[in-house]
Amino acid sequence: ELCDDDPPKITHATFKAVAYKEGTMLNCECKRGFRRIKSGSPYMLCTGNSSHSSWDNQCQCTSSAARNTTKQVTPQPEEQKERKTTEMQSQMQLADQVSLPGHCREPPPWENEATERIYHFVVGQTVYYQCVQGYRALHRGPAESVCKMTHGKTRWTQPQLICTGETEPSQFPGEEEPQASPDGLPESETSRLVTTTDFRIQTEVAATMETFIFTTEYQ
């Protein structure tokens, strides 16, 4: 079942799914000057059987200027809709080494894809948050959000994370609530483009984060 809302927006933080639950959809978006080929699917879909999950359909972009003679780029499968960024792929490379049952890994990029990936998550999906460069995390619980469904309505749990500037006096957990929109629903559908710089973190922090993520994911 699709989550009909977005993960919460945390000030000075970005989020990422380490693996995508079956049913997740990724928009086949192309960069400016290119468009999806006419016969191409508008989405990639994470599908699977009992033993293996993979992305169905391939996103293909072709030049908007050309008629029917443009080269049809064969993208590499995989995508979704709700948040994005190709640059994030380089993060948490553990995701490429571990396969979670019933989940797809981050799809490889396809030629001329848009700078932002739009994923449509499904109920049960977990996304993980970390502070952008220059901010440090104050935790009062897991820095993650899960899409849940109650009475036919979907919602994301609130991540227990505050990102504070390195130069600011640090607050203790409990002093300040994370920024969230009313009813715990997201403030924006598509977050700004996250670059590698935004997501770059100290090596030891990265290692800790990876361990934390995979421990959590398997529990």
Partner: antibody, heavy 116, light 106 residues
């Protein structure tokens, strides 16, 4: 209580455009996506697309991607759907429905008739 | 796109009858949702996530199924139940509905 109130019936000429409104009250407008559903005379329901009012992000059924444009105005808690290049086959009742999962609240519907 | 096929398209029944409407999805889906619509009115949520009754819906309505086959049952048809019923999936975009089943007076 939650209410979605739509604009009145419209009669339009082929080739023209129409903009249907859906005013929400009784809940936080930006906390739920607003979906639009179409029903041609004597036919079933077809999903057109949705908007996230807080960000303006839209997702469309590919069938209506070149026909419908969904927008929202946070200041008035109103969602809009504009239909362009109208043809007789666009004659239908158009409903807005509150998202966030199943459609628990619907507008009363707006009949758009396209006739020369 | 996931196609939803309802059967029958029209069902003639009398008050007190047990009525069953089926909905087949062209691909496996997580849940089915059901709406009731009366002439000139907006659809109304009847059953969500396959088997849960929406607020205010009488217990004579029930839903079941999984995968690609789902059923809506009215255990004892009442005068207020003559309407058109639609199944709906929101497991994948585009969201789709069945073509509808009209329950009419026999």
């Amino acid at each position: 209580q939650v209410q979605l109130v739509q604009s009145g019936a419209e009669v339009k000429k082929p080739g023209s455009s129409v903009k249907v409104s859906c005013k929400a009250s009784g809940y936080t407008f930006t906390s739920y996506r607003m979906h639009w559903v179409r029903q041609a005379p004597g036919q079933g329901l077809e999903w057109v697309g949705y908007i996230n009012p807080s960000s303006g992000y839209t997702e469309y059924n590919q069938k209506f991607k070149d026909k419908a444009t969904i927008t929202a105005d946070e200041s008035t808690n109103t969602a809009y759907m504009e239909l362009s290049s109208l043809r007789s086959e666009d004659t239908a009742v158009y409903y807005c429905a509150r998202g966030g999962g199943v459609f628990d609240y619907w507008g009363q519907g707006t009949l758009v008739t396209v006739s020369s | 796109d996931i196609q939803m096929t309802q059967s029958p398209s029209t069902l003639s029944a009398s008050v007190g009858d047990r009525v069953t409407i089926t909905c087949s999805a062209s691909s496996s889906i997580s849940y089915m949702h059901w709406y009731q619509q009366k002439p000139g009115k907006a659809p109304k949520l009847l059953i969500y996530t396959t088997s849960n009754l929406a607020s205010g819906v009488p217990a004579r309505f029930s839903g079941s199924g999984s995968g690609t086959e789902f059923t809506l049952t009215i255990s004892s048809l009442q005068p207020d139940d003559f309407a058109t019923y639609y199944c709906h999936q929101r497991s994948t975009y585009p969201l789709t509905f069945g073509q509808g089943t009209k329950v009419e007076v026999k």
